[in-house]
């Protein structure tokens, strides 16, 4: 079940000073997710800039329907996708030496979900089946978070699927499911 991007409101989150975030990995092939980009600003070096607005990640608002098997929410729900430039990265020469490219260095930062909210959603089912409910876990806010290798990727495990996590009525699932189950958990999910 694809995202229905009716909205694309971006809110910038400013992390604590002294943190040096890096851009989040791109969410795979989601053409409907109009990410807010860097706004055409020139690249900066993390230890050279004094502008804290450079260290921001954005909360993009997206609207989608919650599905659970054959059932679908009567109304779409709106939630956040954490995206955007979490902060500048060092500008390093690439391996070939032609031009320059972005490569993270120093502390590892990600624009990730900060808080979640659970929402009970009414689902309508086809063929005369009684309406159902599902509890859905939705991203409520984002933040730039410094990750260490000791996080063992747990912070990122659901990065990209959390946003796609659905459903109270089916309440959120603690863990992301496989792609197929994810349909049921996007359709079903959590």
């Amino acid at each position: 079940q694809g995202w229905q991007a009716f909205k694309n409101d971006a809110t910038e989150i400013i992390p604590e000073l002294g943190e040096y975030p890096e851009p989040p990995p791109e969410l795979e092939n989601n053409k409907t997710m109009n990410r807010a980009e860097n706004g055409g600003r020139p690249p900066h070096h993390p230890f050279e800039t004094k502008d804290v607005s450079e260290y921001s990640c954005r909360e993009l608002h997206f609207t989608r329907y919650v599905t659970d098997g054959p059932c679908r929410s009567a109304k779409p729900v709106t939630e956040l996708v954490c995206s955007g430039q979490c902060g500048p990265a060092r500008l390093l020469p690439n391996a070939i030496g032609r031009g320059k490219w972005w490569r993270p260095s120093g502390p590892d930062f990600r624009c990730i979900p900060d808080r979640y909210r659970a929402q009970r959603v009414q689902l309508l089912c086809p063929g005369g089946e009684a309406p159902r409910a599902r509890k859905v876990r939705l991203v409520a806010s984002c933040k730039c978070k410094r990750l260490t290798r000791f996080h063992n990727q747990s912070e990122l495990k659901d990065f990209g699927t959390e946003a796609a996590r659905p459903q109270k009525g089916r309440k959120p699932r603690p863990r992301a499911r496989s792609a197929k189950a994810n349909q049921a958990e996007l359709e079903n999910a959590y």
Epitope: G69, R134, K135, V136, R170, P172
Partner: antibody, heavy 119, light 107 residues
Framework: EVQLVQSGAEVKKPGASVKVSCKAS????????MHWVRQAPGQGLEWIGR????????IYDPKFQGRVTMTTDTSTSTAYMELRSLRSDDTAVYYC????????????WGQGTLVTVSS | DIQMTQSPSSLSASVGDRVTITCKAS??????VAWYQQKPGKAPKLLIY???TRHTGVPSRFSGSGSGTDFTLTISSLQPEDFATYYC?????????FGGGTKVEIK
């Protein structure tokens, strides 16, 4: 890691009450519906009821209505099921389970608590 | 209440066999059926939900089908670890109800 850890085995006399606990970790119980299911020795599974920890809303199987009370303590992420006026045929393993759906299947289960009712 | 009648109650099979278990609902439950596997002394494990959707990590040899009142769980090629008891459950409406179980034993 998502876990449901239940309290230990109990032996009760007929007419007594038992309260079984189920402590959740790795997730927020308010985001799910907590169910209780029992299984008598050598028998099948029997649904008792469910509670929404977020608001205390409860649905019981009518056959247990009046004898069972389900509660949750969200501060400790623990669900409780109390069964009163115990009879010998209440001897069973009691499981807690949860899911986000209402009604639901059960994605995760506790390890079970054996309640033996014997005089 | 919706009754779920499972058959057979037990069956004997060999490793590599194709095994089919059926579940019949007393009224239309659409596709709101789940299947579980349970081994002695253990809690049930979810295999299938929405009649045919495999739960995460469940081997592809397990498949479910059906809608309305008739449902089937199929194990395409029985493995040693599949000897267990299997239950169907309807979640179309409360109270939730389970089938009586099918015990799959080694022939």
């Amino acid at each position: 890691e998502v876990q449901l850890v239940q309290s230990g085995a109990e032996v009760k006399k007929p007419g007594a009450s038992v309260k079984v606990s189920c402590k959740a970790s790795g997730f927020n119980i308010k985001d799910y519906y907590m169910h209780w299911v029992r299984q008598a020795p050598g028998q099948g599974l029997e649904w008792i009821g469910r509670i929404d920890p977020e608001n205390g809303d409860i649905i019981y199987d009518p056959k247990f209505q009046g004898r069972v009370t389900m509660t949750t303590d969200t501060s400790t992420s623990t669900a409780y099921m109390e069964l009163r006026s115990l009879r010998s045929d209440d001897t069973a393993v009691y499981y807690c389970a949860y899911d986000a759906g209402d009604p639901a299947w059960f994605t995760y289960w506790g390890q079970g608590t054996l309640v033996t009712v014997s005089s | 209440d919706i009754q779920m009648t499972q058959s057979p109650s037990s069956l004997s099979a060999s490793v590599g066999d194709r095994v089919t278990i059926t579940c019949k609902a007393s009224q239309d439950v659409f596709t709101a059926v789940a299947w579980y596997q349970q081994k002695p002394g253990k809690a049930p494990k979810l295999l299938i939900y929405w009649a045919s959707t495999r739960h995460t990590g469940v081997p592809s040899r397990f498949s479910g089908s059906g809608s309305g009142t008739d449902f089937t769980l199929t194990i395409s090629s029985l493995q040693p670890e599949d000897f267990a008891t299997y239950y169907c459950q309807q979640y179309s409406s409360y109270p939730l109800t389970f089938g009586g179980g099918t015990k799959v034993e080694i022939k």
